[in-house]
Amino acid sequence: SEVEYRAEVGQNAYLPCFYTPAAPGNLVPVCWGKGACPVFECGNVVLRTDERDVNYWTSRYWLNGDFRKGDVSLTIENVTLADSGIYCCRIQIPGIMNDEKFNLKLVIKPAKVTPAPTRQRDFTAAFPRMLTTRGHGPAETQTLGSLPDINLTQISTLANELRDSRLANDLRDSGATIRIG
């Protein structure tokens, strides 16, 4: 079943998806779509990359990470309740039926009404790159990947702050990571 991610109305949502290019700059086409992954490509495409660049995108959807290094995580700007649902990240590895498909479920919660501003950690800002904790196939990896200067205590604190959002589990087991080559 889909890994679940949460965001509040008005925030930016972050849906992680990674692959490791076989060689630097040796990119693989990727598409993001609203709806579960169909047989080919993505349904209701919101963003697409080719071997060189992002070649199609729609407003509010962008890649915040370095997609040239395989970080094809999707950021959805200023989410509304209508953004809830399943999203497909598809990594189109050349070959016979080689595509890797990931279905990620986004749950949007109504914004909390607070009487006075309180300190809230923005997960995307504080921790913009998901841990690449699970590879596929023989090249299984367990790596923290390319993270900002943040120690394990901070990660643990962030995980505690976000336990409600199930993202804590994803620090352990992100389903949208693949190593190529």
Epitope: P38, V39, F40, G43, V45, Y56, T58, Q92, P94
Partner: antibody, heavy 123, light 107 residues
């Protein structure tokens, strides 16, 4: 006007080979996924194989992938299906079809089909 | 593989009738369902995609509905040219699979 014209069908003995071709015109061929679908006499439709825009990604019915090879030549606006070790159960009309496409859609359904070419495998 | 089961296998109706053909998927396919019409000796024609979107040039008497595992194609008022075979096709799981077809005949 979009046109897909299949050729290369015919009578072949079991164990033999055939190469089907599909000539495309009336659209930018390299922008579209292409697919082969077959239909045995008096039977329903069966998906055979598909290929992405540039030919780098291919998809097959599991039971056929060791014997059939899909390919394309975008410079010639042509799609091919190489069929080896043919069996009687491969007897069918083979259709070439175009994956429906526009930016923001996926090519998982087929908006134009050729007229089909009949492949008969019999001794 | 995802199995697609159409019912009925054949159907006799008259011009002007309202007819509904159903298609059941063996597992959830969301809205990833397509309907085609095929006349004898001809190639299939795209009618409806994504369960309910009418293809370009298809008359409005055709409509599709459903999601998940249950889908239907309805013709609100049969015309003589509608007598044909109809197939559903799922495009959620590999391989793409079609229903066995429904033959719509003149009563």
């Amino acid at each position: 006007e979009v046109q897909l014209v299949e050729s290369g069908g015919g009578l072949v003995k079991p164990g033999g080979s055939l190469r089907l071709s599909c000539a495309a015109s009336g659209f930018t061929f390299s922008d579209y996924y292409m697919t082969w679908v077959r239909q045995a006499p008096g039977k329903g439709l069966e998906w055979v194989s598909s290929i992405n825009y540039d030919g780098r990604n291919t998809y097959y019915l599991d039971s056929l992938k060791s014997r059939f090879t899909i390919s394309r030549d975008n410079a010639k606006n042509s799609l091919y299906l190489q069929m080896n070790s043919l069996r009687a159960e491969d007897t069918a009309v083979y259709y070439c079809a175009r994956g429906y496409y526009y930016y923001g859609s996926s090519p998982n359904y087929f908006d134009y089909w050729g007229q089909g070419t009949l492949v008969t495998v019999s001794s | 593989d995802i199995q697609m089961t159409q019912s009925p296998s054949s159907l006799s109706a008259s011009v002007g009738d309202r007819v509904t053909i159903t298609c059941r998927a063996s597992e959830n396919i969301y809205s990833y369902l397509t309907w085609y019409q095929q006349k004898p000796g001809k190639s299939p024609k795209l009618l409806v995609y994504n369960a309910k979107t009418l293809a370009e040039g298809v008359p409005s008497r055709f409509s599709g509905s459903g999601s998940g595992t249950q889908f239907s194609l309805t013709i609100s008022s049969l015309q003589p040219e509608d007598f044909a075979n109809y197939y559903c096709q799922q495009h959620y799981g590999t391989p793409l699979t079609f229903g066995q077809g429904t033959k719509l005949e003149i009563k």
